[in-house]
């Protein structure tokens, strides 16, 4: 094959080199960017900067190297657009320093910064924590500070990220409430802060307020779906990020629900039941409180992490005619109680009659739902029977 | 595989207490009931109670109610059986065993407890 | 409590023989369940909820009954079945065990 007069040659399937001295000051209008998977640049002293447009449309590269150029900056956000980039070499270039952000969100294999100028400071306390946890082969390259020493050697007490504390209210939070969050940061070089709120959706009206140091957000007209929603807060440095989460309880009264049985290994009376704090529960069964056993009692399912709503079963593992009746779900919490009852009949009885039992004549409808503020015994809706003597 | 490993044999003097630990392995701890079941010398098996780690609700055998305590370390996945004020004829193989949906599907090997002056 | 008794209390046996306990309850019970156990082992679980085998139960055991009347049987005795059979409620607290049906070699 001729040899290649470009700046850039192809090399293999879906590699580019570019090898010819001083060919490049950007990476724009790579041939066939698209599809590369390995870009190999050197002796490029013209390329000094390395931003984001100079790698767009270079969503396959997994390898990329740049050595013996002019390399003297690369921007935090310049990988952007190489998310499965996984080598990158960037020995014997002018870099003094990289920031976290830079390699942030990329899994690296490996990462080559050997022959650079490097300069201790925080902002490479990261790659400090690469060469101490053994990662992307740094270790190996004994990396130095341009006239400091090792970069293994460089004091790091004072390379904290920063500090985050946040408010809350202490008082119980009520439905239509109002409520302030305050974000107190602190920390050196602070650069970015801010609040994640994207699990909020119609929870509350939001409003931020403030700046680095003390960041404020109010939540206004708060819905009880704000329970259980992540509410962060987050800042920058040079050294790294950090984040708060905080939850914001909003109480409201228990509720509950309950369904019509069903046979899943052995029996299940399913229920829901919600409310903040979460209620205590309590069964019945024909009016009399139910003592759980190992063979009935409440199981709840796991619950959604986002979400004050519990849903489980009341477990009945033998039932027989004997458990056939109503019953009844009492769920109370300090703002409110509730109750719900079912029919429920899950054998018939193999007696014709028991002498001593009453003879059903009518029952509520099966499956009867009631929901209700309070738990109500309705006694004009319960079986009446009538007793046999046999002599 | 679903383990229950039961504490080493005791040896007790009368009025004394003993406390018994079973501890589970392969499961869901708090998912299942743990009970409690004693067996005498040449005799039958006795339900002492029952207890559910998930929330800590126990229901006992009348005849034991005023001297077990049953108890739950779920960060360590172990059930306890204490029982007190112990005469001789406390003496038996002590055993745990978990049911969820069918009874006693597993049992430990037992613990030996001796009551004697 | 509901009171589960057995019968027989012992039985003699030979390899190959139909072999069948019952257990009756004072008091009417869903299920019955059954449990096996060996000299210094503890009990095993055989058959529950009336009729069906445990895990790695060999199918020459089989359980029947309802209300207060149940049977345990098995088909055709092997020499690893000679055990104590002890039958099991778990309709009512407490939870109650019947003395037990030792069973030997003839």
């Known amino acids: 094959a001729a040899p290649c007069p470009d700046a850039c040659c192809p090399h293999g399937s879906s590699g580019l080199r570019c090898t010819r001295d001083g060919a490049l000051d950007s990476l724009h209008h790579l041939p066939g960017a698209e599809n590369l998977t390995e870009l190999y640049i050197e002796n490029q002293q013209h390329l000094q900067h390395l931003e984001l447009r100079d790698l767009r449309g270079l969503g396959e590269l997994r390898n990329l190297t740049i050595v013996k150029s002019g390399l003297r900056f690369v921007a935090p956000d310049a990988f952007h657009f190489t998310p499965r980039l996984s080598r990158l070499n960037l020995s014997f270039n002018a870099l003094e320093s990289l920031s976290w952000k830079t390699v942030q969100g990329l899994s690296l294999q490996e990462l080559v910064l050997s022959g650079n100028p490097l300069h201790c400071s925080c902002a490479l306390r990261w790659l400090q924590r690469w060469e101490e946890e053994g990662l992307g082969g740094v270790p190996e390259q004994k990396l130095q500070c341009h006239g400091q020493g090792p970069l293994a050697h460089m004091p790091n007490a004072s390379c904290g990220v920063p500090t985050l504390k946040v408010q809350v209210p202490n008082a119980s939070v009520d439905v239509g409430d109002d409520v302030l969050l305050r974000c107190q940061v602190e920390g050196r070089g602070l650069e970015q802060a801010g609040w994640i709120l994207t699990e909020l959706e119609q929870s509350a009206t939001v409003m931020k307020s403030g700046g680095l140091p003390s960041l404020g957000l109010t939540l206004a007209n708060v819905t009880s779906d704000l329970n259980r929603k992540n509410v962060t807060c987050w800042a920058e440095n040079d050294v790294g990020r950090a984040e708060v989460s905080v939850q914001v309880n909003v109480s409201f009264p228990a509720s509950v629900q309950l369904h019509t049985a069903v046979e899943m290994h052995h029996w299940c009376i399913p229920f829901s039941v919600d409310g903040q704090p979460a209620p205590s529960l309590r069964w019945l069964f024909n009016g009399s409180v139910l003592n759980e056993t190992s063979f009935i009692f409440t199981e709840f399912l796991e619950p959604a992490a986002n979400e004050t709503v519990r849903h489980g079963c009341l477990r009945l593992n033998q039932p027989t005619h004997v458990n056939n009746g109503n019953y009844t779900l009492l769920a109370a919490n300090p703002f409110g109680q509730a109750s719900a009852s079912i029919m429920a009949a899950f054998m018939d009885n193999p007696f014709e009659f028991n002498p001593e039992d009453p003879i059903p004549v009518s029952f509520s409808p099966v499956d009867t739902n009631s929901t209700s503020g309070d738990p109500v015994e309705k006694k004009d809706e319960t079986p009446f029977g009538v007793s046999v003597a046999v002599g | 595989q679903v383990q229950l490993v039961q504490s080493g044999a005791e040896v007790k003097k009368p009025g004394a207490s003993v406390k018994v630990s079973c501890k589970s392995s392969?499961?869901?701890?708090?998912?299942?009931?743990m009970h409690w079941v004693r067996q005498a010398p040449g005799q039958g098996l006795e339900w002492m109670g029952e207890i559910y780690p998930n929330n800590g609700r126990v229901n006992y055998n009348e005849k034991f109610k005023n001297r077990v305590t049953m108890t739950v370390d779920i960060s360590i996945s172990t059930a306890y059986m204490e029982l007190s004020r112990l005469r001789s004829d406390d003496t038996a193989v002590y055993y745990c065993?978990?049911?969820?949906?069918?009874?006693?599907?597993?049992w430990g090997q037992g613990t030996t407890v001796t009551v004697s002056s | 409590d509901v009171q589960l008794t057995q019968s027989p209390s012992s039985l003699s046996a030979s390899v190959g023989d139909r072999v069948t306990i019952t257990c009756s309850a004072s008091s009417s019970v869903g299920y019955m369940h059954w449990y096996q156990q060996k000299p210094g082992k503890a009990p095993k679980r055989l058959i529950y909820?009336?009729?069906k085998l445990a895990s790695g139960v060999p199918s020459r055991f089989s359980g029947s009954g309802s209300g207060t009347d149940y049977t345990l049987t098995i088909s055709s005795l092997q020499p690893e079945d000679f055990a104590t059979y002890f039958c099991q409620q778990w309709s009512s607290i407490p939870l109650t065990f019947g003395q037990g049906t030792r069973l030997e070699i003839k």
């Open positions: 909820d009336t009729s």
């Open positions: 392969g499961y869901t701890f708090t998912n299942y009931w």
């Open positions: 065993a978990r049911s969820r949906y069918d009874p006693m599907e597993d």
